[in-house]
Structures are given as structure tokens and as C-alpha cells.
């Protein structure tokens, strides 16, 4: 029997590797029952995950499972870091595991490097 | 029934290339994290690496770093290791396993290929 | 690199009898999401490993209740109540907190 359970759809230890001036939309895929959650995004500092207010947020439903996206529009060097999403649902809160953007600075990469160049050259990323 | 079928190991002289596949069955691929271990002979297991099948990110044990590549085809449900100027030391058995990436609901194992590096 | 330690590294057991493997890590494995990714394997002779334990002390399916992980931070152990002839085998502790992903050397379980 399916879980009537809220659940979002974050991998842990997820990340992207992304370039500062493109833009990017960053997914929490959430399953719900009946009646949707209230989602919202937040940054992690620390230890202390900082809730994103006045942000581009959207929602998008397919089949089996909604999304809520963080829109960046631009993506900026301060972008960089985890993210992590939580679910409002019969005053539970229900959190995701944390995203992070890898965030490149064009200005100072001579060509794009890969992504997985990216996760694994630190200097190249702001923290 | 989940199933994980690693296949493509064999003999291989040192200093060549060697490409293993899992084929994998009864699970969502995109859902897991691949991971690539090995174990030689009569010795303990050590991680390779792991691909995201979702979107192709990768992560390595710093020693295979630039010798192996781990990659996966979601649509075929198949991933791959591909060894790049084997050594002697690299013969192993080599083991593809599959975890859940969300809750860690599961973590499947396949049989494992043996590959021997040999001149 | 987060080196695992575990003892002992041989472990013969009557049967019936409890079974005991320490695992120790050089760095604590609890999570910033506040979970500690620990992790016991059995590899019974000529076979593939298996998941036994996940998140210190969460047993796999089908997996039996005599087997049961505890601990926290940097000290684990997994026990079995009473030993039975399908336990021989090697019993890994692994970690998926830090990259990269290290393993104990392994404790071999036989029957005496």
C-alpha cells in the first residue's frame, strides 16, 4: 500500500554544477494525496537553514508527482551553496535533503569546464 | 524482481581499457545512486565511485580519479565502468550496487565480474 | 579520508551463542541533515554483498531480528543474538557520511 505521507524527491548529496548569468530552475519534487502542501525553499548557513522569501517560485504537476521550483533569473556567484526544500503538511514539517548549486563564475574560467571538473575543483567555486 | 547483472569483465593485458555494464531490473534506476565497488583477491571491498543516473553527476575515490569513468543510461536502466590503463593490482572482482537516493529504502547488490589484469 | 577500524577481524562463535563486531570511525559520521550513514554489509563465503543494516540501526528486509546495529558519532557495533550456521561469512561496516565512501577491513564470522 502507497504511503498517504508527504514526500519530497531530493536526492542526499545532490548537486548541480551551474554557470553565474545563466538561468536555472531548481526542483522539489513532491508527492502528496489529496490536498498539495505549502513548500518553501530555504539556503543553508551553517547549520541554520535561512528561509527564501520574495524569491520566483512556481509550481509544475505532472502524472504522479508536483514540483516546486526556485527560479534563478540570473544565476549569481552568491547562489552558490546548499538548498534544501520543506513541506508544511498536518502542521508537520517535512524536509528535504540539501542541493547544492555549484556555481561558476564565466569571468574567471577561461572555457566551461565540466561538471564534474567543477565539483571537484573548490577554487573555481564561491563559497 | 530486482536484479543487477554486471557483465564485461574477463582477462586484460596491463596498460589497456576495459568497459563493464549492470544491467539492471525491477527498480526505477533515476530513483538510486550506482555505485562501482571492487574487492581483490582475499581482500576487503573498496568504493570506485557513483553516478546519478538522474543527471549524469559523478563522484570518485580520489585514486581512480582520471582513470575511471562511471556513467549510466537511465532509458536502458544499464550503467558502466570504464577502466582506463589497467594495472595488475587493478585485478578484482568488481561489484555494481544500487541505492535508493532519497530514503535509503534499499540497497541492492549484483553478482559481481572478475577482472584479471595479466600479461 | 575517514578510516574505518574494526575488531575483531577474526570472530569464532558456538552456535546459539551471541556474536559482537565493533566498528570505529576516525571521524564522526553524523550528518549535518542530522543522520549518521552507517552501514553493515554481510558477504557470506562465494556470494556478493548484501545489505544488512542502513543508518546505524535500520535492518533490510528480510533480513533476520537477530541481527541489530547501535551506536553513534564515531562507535558502532553490530550484534547477533544467537549465531546460526548461515551467518558464517565477513560482516563490513561501511560509511556514506564523507567522500570518499571507506570500509572496515572486515570481521570473519566462523562457527567454532
Known amino acids: 500500500k502507497e504511503s498517504c505521507d508527504v514526500q519530497l524527491y531530493i536526492k542526499r548529496q545532490s548537486y548541480h554544477s551551474i554557470f553565474a548569468g545563466d538561468p536555472f530552475k531548481l526542483e522539489c519534487p513532491v508527492k502528496y494525496c489529496a490536498h498539495r502542501p505549502q513548500v518553501t525553499w530555504c539556503k543553508l548557513n551553517g547549520t541554520t537553514c535561512v528561509k527564501l522569501e520574495g524569491r520566483h517560485t512556481s509550481w509544475k504537476q505532472e502524472k504522479n508527482l508536483s514540483f516546486f521550483i526556485l527560479h534563478f533569473e540570473p544565476v549569481l556567484p552568491s547562489d552558490n551553496g546548499s538548498y534544501r526544500c520543506s513541506a508544511n503538511f498536518l502542521s508537520a514539517i517535512i524536509e528535504s535533503h540539501s542541493t547544492t548549486l555549484y556555481v561558476t563564475d564565466v569571468k574567471s574560467a577561461s572555457e566551461r569546464p565540466s561538471k564534474d571538473e567543477m565539483a571537484s575543483r573548490p577554487w573555481l567555486l564561491y563559497s | 524482481e530486482v536484479q543487477l547483472v554486471e557483465s564485461g569483465g574477463g582477462l586484460v593485458q596491463p596498460g589497456r581499457s576495459l568497459r563493464l555494464s549492470c544491467t539492471t531490473s525491477?527498480?526505477?534506476?533515476?530513483?538510486?545512486?550506482i555505485h562501482w565497488f571492487r574487492q581483490a583477491p582475499g581482500k576487503g571491498l573498496e568504493w570506485v565511485g557513483r553516478?546519478?543516473?538522474?543527471?549524469?553527476?559523478?563522484k570518485y575515490t580520489a585514486s581512480f580519479k582520471g582513470r575511471a569513468t562511471i556513467s549510466a543510461d537511465g532509458s536502458k536502466s544499464i550503467a558502466y565502468l570504464q577502466m582506463n590503463s589497467l594495472k595488475t593490482e587493478d585485478t578484482a572482482v568488481y561489484y555494481c550496487a544500487s541505492y535508493e537516493g532519497y530514503y535509503e529504502r534499499f540497497g541492492y547488490w549484483g553478482q559481481g565480474t572478475l577482472v584479471t589484469v595479466s600479461s | 579520508d575517514v578510516v574505518m577500524t574494526q575488531s575483531p577481524l577474526s570472530l569464532p562463535v558456538t552456535l546459539g551463542q551471541p556474536a559482537s563486531i565493533s566498528c570505529r570511525s576516525s571521524?564522526?559520521?553524523?550528518?549535518?541533515?542530522?543522520?549518521?550513514?552507517l552501514n553493515w554489509l554481510q558477504q557470506r563465503p562465494g556470494q556478493s554483498p548484501r545489505r544488512l543494516i542502513y543508518l546505524v540501526s535500520k535492518r533490510d528486509s528480510g533480513v533476520p531480528d537477530r541481527f541489530s546495529g547501535s551506536g553513534s558519532g564515531t562507535d558502532f557495533t553490530l550484534k547477533i543474538s544467537r549465531v546460526e550456521a548461515e551467518d558464517v561469512g565477513v560482516y563490513y561496516c561501511?560509511?556514506?557520511?564523507?567522500?570518499?565512501?571507506?570500509f572496515g577491513q572486515g570481521t570473519k564470522l566462523e562457527i567454532k
Open positions: 553516478n546519478d543516473p538522474a543527471n549524469g553527476n559523478t
Open positions: 571521524q564522526s559520521l553524523l550528518d549535518r541533515d542530522g543522520k549518521t550513514y
Open positions: 525491477g527498480f526505477n534506476i533515476k530513483d538510486t545512486y
Open positions: 561501511w560509511q556514506d557520511t564523507h567522500f570518499p565512501y571507506t
